[in-house]
């Protein structure tokens, strides 16, 4: 799986979308988990409604929400009041029994609030020449990691 980068601004909401084949994952509940280290387990953050037919209902765990459009085949995760500690590698998953299929690997990057002048020197603004896979609402920008890029810094 390629990793898709979603960037959001600190203090604002970030919306992550995970498209999937609705028939391939028919009847499957979905989950959003956070990768603990490069080879570590993926720790469940939130999952869709226990009744698959009610997957469209938004479920919250703290500041993270999940909702599933099972007909259209799009899982949407909202990270509200994005904080620097939310940055990291995540997965959208399709669940069956004890098994979990990865739908998308997601790297969440948190940008400084442009209105917070203390961090003005650290801001990154996307230039017009840069291309992205998708532009999402709620201040999210996504792109795929370039070949050779790694989602985790090398450990010594």
């Amino acid at each position: 799986h390629n990793t898709t980068v979603f960037q959001g601004v600190a203090g604002q909401s970030l919306q992550v979308s995970c498209p999937y084949d609705s028939m391939k994952h028919w009847g499957r509940r979905k989950a959003w988990c956070r990768q603990l280290g490069e080879k570590g387990p993926c720790q469940r953050v939130v999952s869709t409604h226990n009744l698959w037919l009610l997957s469209f209902l938004r479920r919250w765990n703290g500041s993270t929400a999940i909702t599933d459009d099972t007909l259209g085949g799009t899982l949407t995760i909202t990270l509200r009041n994005l904080q620097p500690h939310d940055a990291g590698l995540y997965q959208c998953q399709s669940l069956h029994g004890s098994e979990a299929d990865t739908l998308r690997k997601v790297l969440v990057e948190v940008l400084a609030d442009p209105l917070d002048h203390r961090d003005a020197g650290d801001l990154w603004f996307p230039g017009e020449s840069e291309s992205f896979e998708d532009a999402h609402v709620e201040h999210s920008i996504s792109r795929s990691l370039l070949e050779g890029e790694i989602p985790f810094p090398p450990t010594s």
């Epitope: 084949d21 391939k24 037919l53 069956h96 004890s98």
Partner: antibody, heavy 121, light 107 residues
Framework: EVQLVQSGAEVKKPGESLMISCKGS????????IGWVRQMPGKGLEWMGI????????RYSPSFQGQVTISADKSISTAYLQWSSLKASDTAMYFC??????????????WGQGTLVTVSS | EIVMTQSPATLSVSPGERATLSCRAS??????LAWFQQKPGQAPRLLIY???TRATGIPARFSVSGSGTEFTLTISSLQSEDFAVYYC?????????FGPGTKVDIK
């Protein structure tokens, strides 16, 4: 009417290659997983692996990983099971089956008639 | 992988009697269990899926109880067409695994 029609019986020699087929009709072939199941003479059923013809996502049971290749051609609604070098122990009946997913559980709801493969020198 | 065991290996029953077949998993399979019937020279036929849901066209005399690791298939009144081999299959964990089967024959 949903149907899975398998290719005919095969008699082969050890070391030969073989590909058997399973043609689906009466439903959207690309929207359901197709599984392969082995039944050795006088024995029970063994799960070999499964393929989703929509994107050719394939999963193998560890016992069969590297022993067989599962593939599909969605343009002709056909799944395949292939051996590059047959052994006498591959002698068995091979079934394909459609996996239907649903809110009450998964089901291998339609089966092919089976293909008997005999490997003998 | 999960090991499925079925008992008894063979069950001899008279037509009209009740048959009780057991399937046990080495660890919980939740409700991700199916039952199949196979007659000589035929492909298996789906009877039950999701632990207790009868497949289309399966008569009400077939029922399943249990969840987790212990399941029981009951045929309330055996008909002549019910004499066959019965397999359970778990697909809670990869790889899915079948039980060795229970042969139901005429007493």
């Amino acid at each position: 009417e949903v149907q899975l029609v398998q290719s005919g019986a095969e008699v082969k020699k050890p070391g030969e290659s073989l590909m058997i087929s399973c043609k689906g009709s009466g439903y959207s072939f690309t929207s359901y997983w197709i599984g392969w199941v082995r039944q050795m003479p006088g024995k029970g059923l063994e799960w070999m692996g499964i393929i989703y013809p929509g994107d050719s996502d394939t999963r193998y049971s560890p016992s069969f990983q590297g022993q067989v290749t599962i593939s599909a051609d969605k343009s002709i609604s056909t799944a395949y099971l292939q051996w590059s070098s047959l052994k006498a122990s591959d002698t068995a009946m091979y079934f394909c089956a459609r996996r239907r997913q649903g809110i009450w559980g998964d089901a291998l709801d339609f089966w092919g008639q089976g293909t008997l493969v005999t490997v003998s020198s | 992988e999960i090991v499925m065991t079925q008992s008894p290996a063979t069950l001899s029953v008279s037509p009209g009697e009740r048959a009780t077949l057991s399937c046990r998993a080495s660890q919980s399979v939740s409700s991700n269990l199916a039952w199949f019937q196979q007659k000589p020279g035929q492909a298996p036929r789906l009877l039950i899926y999701g632990a207790s849901t009868r497949a289309t066209g399966i008569p009400a005399r077939f029922s399943v109880s249990g969840s987790g690791t212990e399941f029981t298939l009951t045929i309330s009144s055996l008909q002549s067409e019910d004499f066959a081999v019965y397999y359970c299959l778990q697909d809670n964990n990869w790889p899915p695994t079948f039980g060795p089967g229970t042969k139901v024959d005429i007493k």
